[in-house]
Amino acid sequence: ALDTNYCFSSTEKNCCVRQLYIDFRKDLGWKWIHEPKGYHANFCLGPCPYIWSLDTQYSKVLALYNQHNPGASAAPCCVPQALEPLPIVYYVGRKPKVEQLSNMIVRSCKCS
Amino acid sequence: ALDTNYCFSSTEKNCCVRQLYIDFRKDLGWKWIHEPKGYHANFCLGPCPYIWSLDTQYSKVLALYNQHNPGASAAPCCVPQALEPLPIVYYVGRKPKVEQLSNMIVRSCKCS
């Protein structure tokens, strides 16, 4: 699987999950989140050659098409597969509120 | 929706479904399929700017991150959303066999 366990410990050139830290204030302009100040969101990057973690029948076909037509702009793309939530704390007035933000952290990628 | 109805009738620069015809023999090297000779597979292409048909909370965050950090390599990617099957005919000996290939045709795209 193209997950953090594999990708963070290898020098994989093809589609894999990469490290990315997002600072809520600096990178998103969100000043109201109290904790955390930012988080390891990660992102997906890398080419999707034929047979590399292909998601559907279509992505297999497209990767094969791409192999036969190397100059084509049609190719599978490396995108998130498994996403995890992130708990945040913010203040509503002086009262702290905990909220679970769904689908915020990339754990693995796929070629789609 | 970034579907064939909208995308094929517009000059949309952002993520949208584009026309692509795949010839089984020429483009994939598949000589065994009797009918059809090829099909309109389509593909997804175009940038995924902030607010453009974003798939998950994560893709919204990443697009916003990208807006604040234009040089970053982390950005959502335009990939298939709705896929449709394709019926094919091939011969097993002299007996024609009809098979439904699932997820073969792109009907719409999303930013993931």
Partner: antibody, heavy 121, light 111 residues
Framework: QVQLVQSGAEVKKPGASVKVSCKAS????????MNWVRQAPGQGLEWMGQ????????NYNEMYEGRVTMTTDTSTSTAYMELRSLRSDDTAVYYC??????????????WGQGTLVTVSS | DIQMTQSPSSLSASVGDRVTITCRAS??????????MHWYQQKPGKAPKLLIY???NLESGVPSRFSGSGSGTDFTLTISSLQPEDFATYYC?????????FGGGTKVEIK
């Protein structure tokens, strides 16, 4: 420049629902909280609740809990406020207003022009 | 809910007068070194306009004749020299507690 443009006046019957829209421009819609405030004729201001467009997070005034729903469409930078089971005392001007952004509950620096909702049988 | 009591509810004044409006919160609105109190101006048929935020900070574009002061439960909005365009209703607002609440308003009329 920042602009919040609201939908037009509505006349509704008691028991019906109303959905008011607020189209934002001139700033990053998903980076600030959007509030809804109402004002009955000749009365003061009353905060109804708020939504953070990027996440869909909401905080509602308990007075309206269960009767109000705030949503957004980030593709069009539009916020919506739906109020159900309307009564005659819901007759008011409804405003959307952008929070200044340091906190969830905050001061509001830009306001829509207001939408008059009249509830009458 | 935190109750916000404004006084007076209305006042008559002349151009050039110094005008003071007070707002009392039913409990302290101080937190983390800030006073979570704001002031707005509203003219008939128009939306409110933010004048002062966090008790004493002048909103961008607001004339310097407007000022705010106070902490804890007692706050003041002062207009140093009333101008014709200042005749309006003024509201205070707290955001220390959910729900956010406004004062009942002070109407400033021409004498």
């Amino acid at each position: 420049q920042v602009q919040l443009v609201q939908s037009g006046a509505e006349v509704k019957k008691p028991g019906a629902s109303v959905k008011v829209s607020c189209k934002a421009s001139g700033y990053t819609f998903t980076s600030e909280w959007m509030n809804w405030v109402r004002q009955a004729p000749g009365q003061g201001l009353e905060w109804m609740g708020q939504i953070f467009p990027a996440l869909g997070s909401t905080n509602y005034n308990e007075m309206y809990e269960g009767r109000v729903t705030m949503t957004t469409d980030t593709s069009t930078s539009t916020a919506y406020m739906e109020l159900r089971s309307l009564r005659s005392d819901d007759t008011a001007v409804y405003y959307c207003a952008r929070g200044i952004g340091n906190y969830a509950l905050d001061a509001m620096d830009y306001w829509g022009q207001g939408t008059l909702v009249t509830v009458s049988s | 809910d935190i109750q916000m009591t404004q006084s007076p509810s209305s006042l008559s004044a002349s151009v050039g007068d110094r005008v003071t409006i007070t707002c009392r919160a039913s409990e302290s609105v101080d937190f983390y070194g800030n006073s979570f109190m704001h002031w707005y101006q509203q003219k008939p048929g128009k939306a409110p306009k933010l004048l002062i935020y966090l008790a004493s900070n002048l909103e961008s574009g607001v004339p310097s004749r407007f000022s705010g002061s106070g902490s804890g439960t007692d706050f003041t909005l002062t207009i140093s020299s009333l101008q014709p365009e200042d005749f309006a209703t003024y509201y205070c607002q707290q955001n220390i507690e959910d729900p956010l609440t406004f004062g009942g308003g002070t109407k400033v009329e021409i004498k």
